[in-house]
C-alpha cells in the first residue's frame, strides 16, 4: 500500500520556554506531509498542524490548558496529494514523542532586570515578572503566578571596578542588598527552580550597571 513513498518522522523533540511549546522532528518532507496529535496520558488525541510540510508544530495552546499534566505527541506521515493513503497495517506511519510535563520541563526564559534603586548603602533590584502563555480567567499569568513557591531568583552583583562576584537569593522578585557607598555595581539575575532535576536554571539576564538609565540613585 502507501508505505513505500512515506517515511516515519524521527528525532521528535520538545522545545519549550516559559510554556511556549513547539514539537520539532525530522526529516524535511519529500513528497509527504505530516499531521500531529497530542494527548494527555488519560485523554483523547487531538489533531494539530494538519497535513503540513513544516517539521515543527506549535502545541502551546494545548499544553497551557494544564501545565502539570504529562503530554504525549505523535507525528503521522502521509503521501503528498494522497493523504487518505495508509500504511500496510491500515493506518498511516507515525512516531511517538517522548513524554513531556511542561511544569517540570519547560525552559526558564532569560529574565530581565526591571529596575534598581539605591538608597544610601542599600540597593533594591527588581526582576521583571515575565508573562507566560498560561491563562486563567482570560488573563495571562506571570512566571511567578505559575510556579509560586517553586521559583527563586539568584542575583549576581559585583563592583564595576572588580571581578569578584557576590550572590543573593530571593523567593520574591526583589533583592535588597548592601553595597559600598560611592561604588558602582553591575547586576545580573537568573531564574531557578531548585526542585527540578532538568532545566533548573535560566540563562543569565543581560547585565545592568549603576550609572545607566535603568537605575535610580538617591542619597539619603
Amino acid at each position: 500500500s502507501g508505505t513505500t513513498n512515506t517515511v516515519a518522522a524521527y528525532n521528535l523533540t520538545w522545545k519549550s520556554t516559559n510554556f511556549k511549546t513547539i514539537l520539532e522532528w525530522e526529516p524535511k518532507p519529500v513528497n509527504q506531509v505530516y499531521t500531529v496529535q497530542i494527548s494527555t496520558k488519560s485523554g483523547d488525541w487531538k489533531s494539530k498542524c494538519f497535513y503540513t510540510t513544516d517539521t515543527e508544530c506549535d502545541l502551546t495552546d494545548e499544553i497551557v490548558k494544564d501545565v502539570k499534566q504529562t503530554y504525549l505527541a505523535r507525528v503521522f506521515s502521509y503521501p503528498a496529494g494522497n493523504v487518505e493513503s495508509t500504511g500496510s497495517a491500515g493506518e498511516p506511519l507515525y512516531e511517538n514523542s517522548p513524554e513531556f510535563t511542561p511544569y517540570l520541563e519547560t525552559n526558564l526564559g532569560q529574565p530581565t532586570i526591571q529596575s534598581f534603586e539605591q538608597v544610601g548603602t542599600k540597593v533594591n533590584v527588581t526582576v521583571e515578572d515575565e508573562r507566560t502563555l498560561v491563562r486563567r480567567n482570560n488573563t495571562f499569568l506571570s512566571l511567578r503566578d505559575v510556579f509560586g513557591k517553586d521559583l527563586i531568583y539568584t542575583l549576581y552583583y559585583w563592583k564595576s571596578s572588580s571581578s569578584g562576584k557576590k550572590t543573593a537569593k530571593t523567593n520574591t522578585n526583589e533583592f535588597l542588598i548592601d553595597v559600598d557607598k560611592g561604588e558602582n555595581y553591575c547586576f545580573s539575575v537568573q531564574a531557578v527552580i531548585p526542585s527540578r532535576t532538568v532545566n533548573r536554571k535560566s540563562t543569565d539576564s543581560p547585565v545592568e550597571c549603576m550609572g545607566q538609565e535603568k537605575g535610580e540613585f538617591r542619597e539619603i
Epitope: 504529562t70 499569568l141 517553586d150 527540578r196
Partner: antibody, heavy 120, light 109 residues
C-alpha cells in the same frame, strides 16, 4: 477526582522504624508536592516536610531531619514517609496532603490519616 | 524557625461576619508567604479552603475569603453558618518550609 489514601494504623516498639504510604489517584502525581503533616492532641498541626515526586526533590522541617525520610514511586503513584528510631513522642496521626502550588496554591486534598502508636 | 500565631478560639453567631488572623513572628505576612487556610472537622476531616493568600479552592463556598489585613493574613467568613464550626489552621511558607499556626477553634452559636 483527586484522592489520597494512606496506609493503616501502626503499633510499633520504641527504636523501630515504620514506613507510611500515601497512594494518589486522579491527577498527574509527578507534578504536585506531597506534604507530610503530624498531629498530636493538644499540639495542633506540625509540618514535617514535602516531596515533589517528579524530581524526588525534598524539603524538611529542621526538627524532623534524621527522623523522617521521604520517597516517591511514580510508577505506582505512591509517596512514602519512613520514621526511624521511634519514641513515644512519635505517637501521632500522620497526614499526607497535596500542595497545588502556583497560581491556585492550596493544600487541596488530604489523606485520611495514619495513626501511629509507639509503645513497649 | 518562625512562629505563626492564631487566635486560640473565637465565637460567632449564624449570619455574622468573623475574621480569623495569622501572624508571623518574623514580621509582616506578604504574598510570598503563600498563606494557606485549612479547615478541620471532627474525625480528622481536613479541607483546604484558601491558598496563595486569597485563592479559594474549588467547591469552597464564596463566604470564605482570604486576604492580608495590616501585617497579618486573614480568613473572613461572611455570613457564618453552623456547619462552619471547626478548627481553622493557617500555614505560611518561609523560603523552603511551611509553618502551621496553632489553630483557631471557631464556635458558631
Amino acid at each position: 477526582q483527586v484522592q489520597l489514601k494512606e496506609s493503616g494504623a501502626e503499633l510499633m516498639k520504641p527504636g523501630a522504624s515504620v514506613k507510611i504510604s500515601c497512594k494518589a489517584t486522579g491527577y498527574t502525581f509527578s507534578s504536585y508536592w506531597i506534604e507530610w503533616v503530624k498531629q498530636r492532641p493538644g499540639h495542633g498541626l506540625e509540618w514535617i516536610g514535602e516531596i515533589l515526586p517528579g524530581s524526588g526533590s525534598t524539603n524538611y522541617n529542621e526538627k524532623f531531619k534524621g527522623k523522617a525520610t521521604f520517597t516517591a514511586d511514580t510508577s505506582s503513584n505512591t509517596a512514602y514517609m519512613q520514621l526511624s528510631s521511634l519514641t513515644s513522642e512519635d505517637s501521632a496521626v500522620y497526614y499526607c496532603a497535596r500542595d497545588r502550588n502556583g497560581y491556585v496554591n492550596y493544600f487541596d486534598s488530604w489523606g485520611q490519616g495514619t495513626t501511629l502508636t509507639v509503645s513497649s | 524557625q518562625a512562629v505563626v500565631t492564631q487566635e486560640s478560639a473565637l465565637t460567632t453567631s449564624p449570619g455574622e461576619t468573623v475574621t480569623l488572623t495569622c501572624r508571623s513572628s518574623t514580621g509582616a505576612v506578604t504574598t510570598s508567604n503563600y498563606a494557606n487556610w485549612v479547615q478541620e472537622k471532627p474525625d480528622h476531616l481536613f479541607t483546604g479552603l484558601i491558598g496563595g493568600t486569597n485563592n479559594r479552592a474549588p467547591g469552597v463556598p464564596a463566604r470564605f475569603s482570604g486576604s492580608l489585613i495590616g501585617d497579618k493574613a486573614a480568613l473572613t467568613i461572611t455570613g457564618a453558618q453552623t456547619e462552619d464550626e471547626a478548627i481553622y489552621f493557617c500555614a505560611l511558607w518561609y523560603s523552603n518550609h511551611w509553618v502551621f499556626g496553632g489553630g483557631t477553634k471557631l464556635t458558631v452559636l
